[in-house]
């Protein structure tokens, strides 16, 4: 969490941002909130990016003002116009690119004063794994598959019964480049699995950690998958 203040005493306002991550090819949110004002027409929001000459986005007098927007953000940005009045200056970024990573500044002017806060935005690719029983194999195996990751993640298997066991000798992981030549499909196979056990396939890079669990018993099969972004720190 980054909390920024304006420069001059009583003319400063609090602006708060949250470091976040964007999934390339999808839409992302750059979070920013501020002390709200009564009149929308008195609020100015400017989003800037370090190293970029033009503005990322500007909103003033109740509408977008994009005459000074940098070309790299043309047609890809929007604020939540109906939420600006309650202090939400978050920016929606369409079709996130690897090059969108960097330091952004959320700069706010209201009738109460000015304020700004920086935000670190990471970009990459992350997806939830599917873990399935592979009955085609000679011995019972599990196959963990996740369609899009970047940068290349690590893959680790774990088991509820054999806690702390190292499965690297009985697993095989491969990374296959996807058609857009950036992200990769992750496939990991675990051999010699036993029944009445829960296995977890954990995929992690510096942006996200995803886990796929599977529990196989005589009477049921239970699957779970979840994902956590690793760098959601507020400023």
């Amino acid at each position: 969490l980054i909390i920024g203040f304006g420069i001059s005493g009583r003319h400063s306002i609090t602006v708060t941002t949250v470091a976040s991550a964007g999934n390339i090819g999808e839409d992302g949110i750059l979070s920013c909130t501020f002390e709200p004002d009564i009149k929308l027409s008195d609020i100015v929001i400017q989003w800037l990016k370090e190293g970029v000459l033009g503005l990322v986005h500007e909103f003033k007098e109740g509408k977008d003002e994009l005459s000074e927007q940098d070309e790299m953000f043309r047609g890809r940005t929007a604020v939540f116009a109906d939420q600006v009045i309650v202090g939400n200056a978050s920016l929606r970024l369409k079709n996130v690119q690897l090059t969108d990573a960097g330091t952004y500044k959320c700069y706010i002017i209201t009738s109460k004063g000015k304020g700004n806060a920086n935000l670190e935005y990471k970009t990459g690719a992350f997806s939830m794994p599917e873990v399935n029983v592979d009955y085609n194999a000679s011995s019972e195996t599990l196959r963990c598959e996740a369609p899009r990751w970047f940068p290349q993640p690590t893959v680790v298997w774990a088991s509820q019964v054999d806690q702390g066991a190292n499965f690297s000798e009985v697993s095989n992981t491969s990374f296959e480049l996807n058609s857009e030549n950036v992200t990769m499909k992750v496939v990991s196979v675990l051999y010699n699995v036993t029944i009445n056990n829960t296995y977890s396939c954990m995929i992690e890079n510096d942006i996200a950690k995803a886990t796929g669990d599977i529990k196989v018993t005589e009477s049921e099969i239970k699957r779970r998958s979840h994902l956590q972004l690793l760098n959601s720190k507020a400023s």
Epitope: M128, E130, N132, V133, D134, Y135, N136, R143, E145, A146, P147, K185, K215, E220, I221, K222, R223, R224, S225, H226, L227, Q228, L229
Partner: antibody, heavy 130, light 107 residues
Framework: QVQLQESGPGLVKPSQTLSLTCTVS??????????WSWIRQHPGKGLEWIGN???????YYNPSLKSRVTISVDTSKNQFSLKLNSVTAADTAVYYC??????????????????????WGQGTTVTVSS | DIQLTQSPSFLSASVGDRVTITCWAS??????LAWYQQKPGKAPKLLIY???TLQSGVPSRFSGSGSGTEFTLTISSLQPEDFATYYC?????????FGGGTKVEIK
């Protein structure tokens, strides 16, 4: 969104094998995150899950039918199939093919996948009778 | 297998009524429950997944709640097109099972 269409004989003799095919359009059967399912509904009754298959070939079956069921996938034809052998009159039902899909939901710690049967075929009636 | 019990099996209601259908699971299933609507001669249609998440395109008069073993589907103001049979389904583990259904009829 994918569309599904069931096909196969509407009448099967007792003790024979019921064979149905589901053709997938507006999407690839090789897409990750989808499980290709069969569900049936006996006349005037509720729904019964038969089983499903992932594009890689992993299958999951209802234990009550497991000994008689085979679900297979043909990625080249964008189709998946159901075979149910040794049929009796009790297998008379409307058979639906459907997609079981992982839908990500926001949780306090990130995201969690919730599976749900979100797209269904129109259904095909199969009668078992001599 | 996880058994799902729906109540009531039949329900007579009028347009504008608030309708509540309950689904009980034989064991805890967290929020792994979906609700479907089925009209005669048609395939079921997904209304709600993850117990309370409204499927895209489904009217906001439909809502779901519950966790663990007890779940409810509520229609806040019944419309003519809502007269149908409603099913709950757990997605906690395989085999998936459905509730027996609740038929909502015009009073």
């Amino acid at each position: 969104q994918v569309q599904l269409q069931e096909s196969g004989p509407g009448l099967v003799k007792p003790s024979q094998t019921l064979s149905l095919t589901c053709t997938v359009s507006d999407g690839s059967i090789s897409s990750g995150g989808y499980y290709w399912s069969w569900i049936r509904q006996h006349p005037g009754k509720g729904l019964e899950w038969i089983g499903n298959i992932y594009y890689s070939g992993s299958t999951y079956y209802n234990p009550s039918l497991k000994s008689r069921v085979t679900i297979s996938v043909d990625t080249s034809k964008n189709q998946f199939s159901l075979k149910l052998n040794s049929v009796t009159a009790a297998d008379t039902a409307v058979y639906y093919c459907a997609t079981e899909k992982a839908l990500a939901t926001v949780t306090p710690s990130g995201y969690e996948n919730y599976y749900t049967v979100d797209v269904w075929g129109q259904g095909t009636t199969v009668t078992v009778s001599s | 297998d996880i058994q799902l019990t729906q109540s009531p099996s039949f329900l007579s209601a009028s347009v504008g009524d608030r309708v509540t259908i309950t689904c009980w699971a034989s064991q805890g299933i967290s929020s792994y429950l979906a609700w479907y609507q089925q009209k005669p001669g048609k395939a079921p249609k997904l209304l709600i997944y993850a117990a309370s998440t409204l499927q895209s395109g489904v009217p906001s008069r439909f809502s779901g709640s519950g966790s663990g073993t007890e779940f409810t589907l509520t229609i806040s103001s019944l419309q003519p097109e809502d007269f149908a049979t409603y099913y709950c389904q757990h997605l906690n583990s395989y085999p998936l099972t459905f509730g027996g259904g609740t038929k909502v009829e015009i009073k």
